[in-house]
């Protein structure tokens, strides 16, 4: 907290400039008017302040506007928003989109920091929903955003934000969010054909059912290790070796190299020894043959 | 990686100008202060000013105003400090050092390699 | 402007020993001071920022403390490469400021 001491004679500021540099952190609470910082919130952003400057000139925006700043100086806030709390920033209604941008690329090549994940909060509840061009932005500066969002949060995303969607930007989401983000993603791409479709549909596979592996393994779409190795177990366990086959087209051969781990392993318990012979792979764990497969689950379903 | 990258020796006469350039890489070169401090053979570390690659801003130590320019280039992430009418105590070695903005502090993380002017009639 | 004096300005030690550089501001700067090292021939090489942060890949056996006007540069147990000049600089206002800088020789 600075204390309140008379401008000197002299440096009472008429506008924001270089000039302000030189001034103690006293002589700009007592020579710089609030309201003039506010109207020329943008040439502040361009003058090279030390954070200890920044604190003062905070705090007299602080003391302009103690029920939160209005969007028109949030706007041009630029470097000094690095000086705001999620505190400070919970107070603000952000409804541009423009402000958004500014303000993110503030923190440009900076992890996620609190303020910023407050100001996206706050953005995002004011809109109601995260739309396209929302999304177009925040996963542009932060790739992993979508998967920092809980399932709940996610279940307001409009089908049609999903085109914004780039396969890394899935890359730390998981089993739980490509759970929400799939039926999305199935009805965002509907309307494309098969080849296209499964470009799109790829990255939120780690949420399919069986019954769409199914029926992508009749289209020929020769699916990735990489992309098999992330779908859910519960879905790849019925698949019969066939399918299985089909789905992988060439890639098939992987399977040996990912024997030992999910999905790939819990599938192979079960499944007949014989089918997996089938694929030439020296695949081992499967149901030896002349025993009988129980399934407990249709059984249970029966009952 | 991150780093300044200064440019070579110079050897002026008293009342010529300098200049020395400073390339940045490996960061966002306009969201970083550029700071020019000079060291005297033997002496301490003397601070001559500042300028915000973003926007050309600057300011200058009271000594070296009217003495000193600072300009960036950001097309080639370049900040060039001038200092003209030399004079012999100006022979120091000069480096350009990485500060404030985008950091979390104002402290100087990054030096350039320092680039030696001697001023000698 | 703000001055700052560092002491002392040259200290003889030995490996191992416990090391402690003070710098004092001529007005309170909170904790706005950074300390840094030197190498003949070498730029300075930043070690503590905001009085007490440890720059990243600095050795822990440096340690900074402070705030106000008083500060102070630690070193827990000196080790041979240890051996250099020490500045502490205020960024609390312009212009920025350097201490004198103290030499750290071999004993």
């Known amino acids: 907290e600075v204390e309140k001491t008379a401008c000197p004679s002299g440096k009472k500021a008429r506008e924001i400039d270089e000039s302000l540099i030189f001034y103690k952190k006293w002589e700009l609470e007592a020579c710089v008017d609030a309201a003039l910082l506010a109207t020329q919130m943008d040439r502040v952003n361009a003058i090279p302040f030390t954070y200890e400057q920044l604190d003062v000139l905070k705090h007299k925006l602080d003391e302009l506007y103690p029920q939160g700043y209005p969007e028109s100086v949030i706007q041009h806030l630029g470097y000094l928003f690095l000086k705001m709390s999620p505190e400070d920033i919970r107070k603000w209604n952000v409804t541009s989109l423009e402000t958004l941008k500014a303000l993110l690329e503030v923190n440009k090549g900076h992890e996620m920091s609190p303020q910023v994940a407050t100001l996206i909060d706050r953005f995002v509840k004011g809109r109601g929903q995260l739309d396209k061009d929302t999304l177009d932005t925040l996963t542009a500066f932060y790739p992993g955003y979508l998967c920092s969002l809980s399932p709940e949060e996610l279940s307001s995303v409009p089908p049609s934000s999903i085109w914004a969607v780039r396969p890394q930007d899935l890359d730390t989401c998981d089993p739980r969010q490509l759970d929400v983000l799939y039926p999305k993603a199935r009805l965002a791409f509907q309307n494309m054909n098969g080849s296209e479709y499964f470009v799109k549909i790829q990255s939120f596979l780690g949420g399919a059912p069986t019954e769409d592996l199914k029926a992508l393994s009749q289209q020929n779409v020769s699916m990735d290790l990489a992309t098999f190795m992330k779908l859910r177990t519960d879905a790849v366990l019925p698949l019969t070796v066939a399918e299985v086959q089909k789905l992988l087209g060439p890639h098939v051969e992987g399977l040996k190299a990912e024997e030992r781990h999910r999905p790939v392993r819990d599938w192979i318990l079960r499944q007949r020894q014989d089918d997996l012979d089938t694929l030439g792979l020296g695949l081992q764990g499967g149901i030896p043959n002349g025993y009988l497969v129980l399934d407990l689950s249709m059984q249970e379903a029966l009952s | 990686q991150v780093q300044l990258v200064q440019s070579g020796a110079e050897v002026k006469k008293p009342g010529a100008s300098v200049e020395v350039s400073c390339k940045a890489s490996g960061y966002t070169f306009t969201s970083y202060y550029m700071h020019w401090v000079r060291q005297a053979p033997g002496q301490g570390l003397e601070w001559m000013g500042i300028i915000n690659p973003s926007g050309g801003s600057t300011g200058y130590a009271q000594k070296f105003q009217g003495r000193v320019t600072m300009t960036r280039d950001t097309s080639t992430s370049t900040v060039h400090m001038e200092l003209s009418s030399l004079r012999s105590e100006d022979t120091a070695v000069y480096y350009c050092?990485?500060?404030?903005?985008?950091?979390?502090?104002?402290?100087?993380?990054?030096w350039g390699q320092g680039t030696m002017v001697t001023v000698s009639s | 402007d703000i001055q700052m004096t560092q002491s002392p300005p040259s200290l003889s030690a030995s490996v191992g020993d416990r090391v402690t550089i003070t710098c004092r501001a001529s007005?309170?700067?909170?904790?706005?001071l950074a300390w840094y090292q030197q190498k003949p021939g070498t730029p300075p090489k930043l070690l503590i920022y905001?009085?007490?942060s440890l720059e990243s890949g600095v050795p822990s056996r440096f340690s900074g403390s402070g705030s106000g006007t008083d500060f102070t540069l630690t070193i827990s147990s000196l080790q041979p490469e240890d051996f250099a000049t020490y500045y502490c600089?205020?960024?609390?206002?312009?212009?920025?400021?350097f201490g004198g800088g103290t030499r750290l020789e071999i004993k």
């Open positions: 905001d009085a007490s």
């Open positions: 007005q309170d700067i909170s904790s706005a």
């Open positions: 600089q205020q960024f609390s206002s312009y212009p920025l400021t």
């Open positions: 050092a990485r500060g404030g903005y985008s950091s979390s502090s104002d402290a100087f993380d990054i």
